[in-house]
């Protein structure tokens, strides 16, 4: 039902849901720090624009008595409970930041008359696509799917001369929240990825994955999985791998590949890593100093959520427009704003666009190198390394079907 918003007369409030169930196991204190850092920046920007207004955040905590798994499995009702709490207290702000779990976001969107914008650090699943008042500040599954299809079809690069139309997907149910929804999207029979591929099989057991590595009768040379190098090593170990196997390791929110002294372990030589291009200035931030790379992205999304609100607030105030309107609620899309770490672009549906980077391990240097980049905004792949020092024959990616092309 409609809830009155604390969002007028020069005072603008942001409601931040601090849920016990979260896409990443991040101490709520760190998210609070990120939000507060964002508020400081927003206040400064508004002041510089000559707008003398107050912007604050209200942190809404779940009691944690019922919904206490800590991950996203029991998040569905927690979000609605928090909304009820806000409603009872008549404390809704101009914008809602959180939740991050796909289940809770989907349910909250479904069960409420959302006349206010909702900003999420997460909500990766396809079920949260195309929501009119939802903005997602971490790459959703749809963006990954579009990259994969684009890359599979590419056949005009010096290092990839064959279109691919097949794949195995490894999904064993122990994935992190982001990986769970990424792989879920690839598995879904009605998804764009499944529609574009001629053959796709999901491997659910470790043994299935391990057997494929040397199976002469395998139906595809390509295996997609999600996680970090350690996750792959636990699964693959030092097992022999057929020379035309390509493992695509989706590890979007992990900066460890971009640390200067990192050497790629030997088991990564058959692997292409898909990750996000690293930011430039994050390391000096007070909220990110002690965070792991993934958590840095999560906290940064909260901070950028505050900056996005500040950006929209500034535009509407400068135009003399009302904030508590459907127009404001629907405005958080198809724009670029100044994020903490540079410009942030949102697509027509409010989802963040980014540059994805595909890395390979150089057989010469045992270092990670950029093979290509992919701009999610224009759905285009840009080759960077025209003569990669691959482990694969002739330094070209093999065909996806055994027995054809370079083996």
């Amino acid at each position: 039902s409609q809830v009155s918003q604390n969002c007028h007369n020069g005072s603008y409030e942001i409601s931040v849901l601090m849920m016990g169930n979260s896409a990443f196991a991040e101490p709520l204190k760190n998210l609070e720090d990120a939000v507060n850092e964002g508020l400081e920046i927003v206040r400064g920007r508004l002041q510089n624009a000559g707008l003398n207004v107050t912007v604050n955040a209200t942190f809404m905590y779940s009691d944690g008595l019922i919904h206490n798994s800590g991950d996203c499995r029991s998040s569905t009702c927690e979000g609605l409970d928090l909304l009820r709490k806000i409603s009872n207290a008549q404390r809704m702000g101009c914008v809602l930041i959180g939740p991050s779990c796909t289940y809770s976001t989907f349910q909250m969107y479904l069960d409420t008359e959302l006349s206010y914008p909702m900003i999420s650090a997460g909500s990766f699943g396809l079920s949260c696509d195309y929501k009119e008042t939802l903005t997602r500040l971490m790459s959703p599954a749809r963006k990954l799917m579009y990259f994969l299809v684009n890359f599979w079809k590419t056949n005009d690069l010096p290092f990839k001369t064959y279109s691919w139309s097949t794949s195995y997907v490894y999904k064993n149910g122990t994935e992190t929240e982001d990986c769970f929804w990424y792989l879920n999207a690839l598995e879904a029979s009605v998804s764009y990825f499944s529609h574009e591929l001629g053959f796709k099989v999901v491997l659910r057991q470790d043994k299935e994955f391990q057997d494929i590595l040397m199976d002469h009768n395998r139906k595809s040379n390509v295996i997609i999985m999600c996680g970090g190098p350690e996750f792959l090593y636990k699964l693959k170990g030092d097992r022999a791998v057929a020379e035309d196997i390509v493992i695509i390791l989706v590890d979007l929110f992990n900066d460890q590949y971009f640390e200067d002294n990192v050497t790629a372990p030997d088991y990564m030589k058959n692997v292409l890593v898909l990750t996000l291009s690293p930011g430039n200035s994050l390391l000096n931030s007070s909220f990110s100093r002690n965070l792991s790379p993934t958590k840095r992205d999560f906290a940064l999304a909260y901070l950028n959520g505050i900056l996005l609100f500040g950006h929209m607030l500034k535009i509407f105030l400068e135009n003399g427009e009302n904030i508590t309107t459907p127009k404001f609620a629907h405005a958080f899309r198809n724009l670029t704003f100044e994020g903490y770490d540079g410009p942030v672009t949102l697509d027509d549906w409010g989802d963040v666009d980014s540059t994805m980077v595909l890395l390979y391990t150089s057989v010469d240097t045992k270092k990670y190198k950029v093979l290509l980049t992919y701009d999610t905004h224009v759905n285009k792949t840009y080759p960077v390394d025209m003569s990669p020092t691959f482990t694969w024959k002739n330094s070209k990616l093999p065909n996806d079907i055994t027995g054809r092309g370079p083996q």
């Epitope: 971009f258 200067d260 010469d364 240097t365 190198k369 950029v370 093979l371 840009y382």
Partner: nanobody
Framework: EVQLVESGGGLVQPGGSLRLSCATS????????IGWFRQAPGKEREGVIC???????KYADSVKGRFTISRDNSKNTLYLQMNSLRAEDTAVYYC?????????????????WGQGTMVTVSS
């Protein structure tokens, strides 16, 4: 001795494309960061794109989405693909190299410079 030689400049209409090359010698591309710079008539030289030694491209906002960089180590050559060219892209384009202290960051300054190649965007 480190050498950089740019080529591929010329006259192109607005909205057109050009590909500049930077042929390098005297060093291994894997150990160097490479930058493309430009200097328009009467203006200061500005950075356009840098490619770190690890191969990570970093773009100036003015060219993002229009210009891309790639390298071919087997030919010791870098390429700057310029699409959707505008009149304000008219400049002398320089290739520059610096021994990399970081594999993923662009250096604050460059030690070696090419002679430049002129790009004119005009109808």
């Amino acid at each position: 001795e480190v050498q950089l030689v740019e080529s591929g400049g010329g006259l192109v209409q607005p909205g057109g494309s050009l590909r500049l090359s930077c042929a390098t010698s005297g060093f291994t591309l894997d150990d160097y960061a490479i930058g493309w710079f430009r200097q328009a008539p009467g203006k200061e030289r500005e950075g356009v794109i840098c490619l770190t030694s690890g191969g990570l491209p970093k773009y100036a906002d003015s060219v993002k989405g229009r210009f891309t960089i790639s390298r071919d180590n087997s030919k010791n050559t870098l390429y700057l693909q310029m699409n959707s060219l505008r009149a304000e892209d008219t400049a002398v384009y320089y290739c520059a190299a610096s021994g990399a202290t970081s594999r993923w960051n662009c250096p604050p300054q460059y030690d070696h410079w090419g002679q430049g190649t002129m790009v004119t965007v005009s109808s």
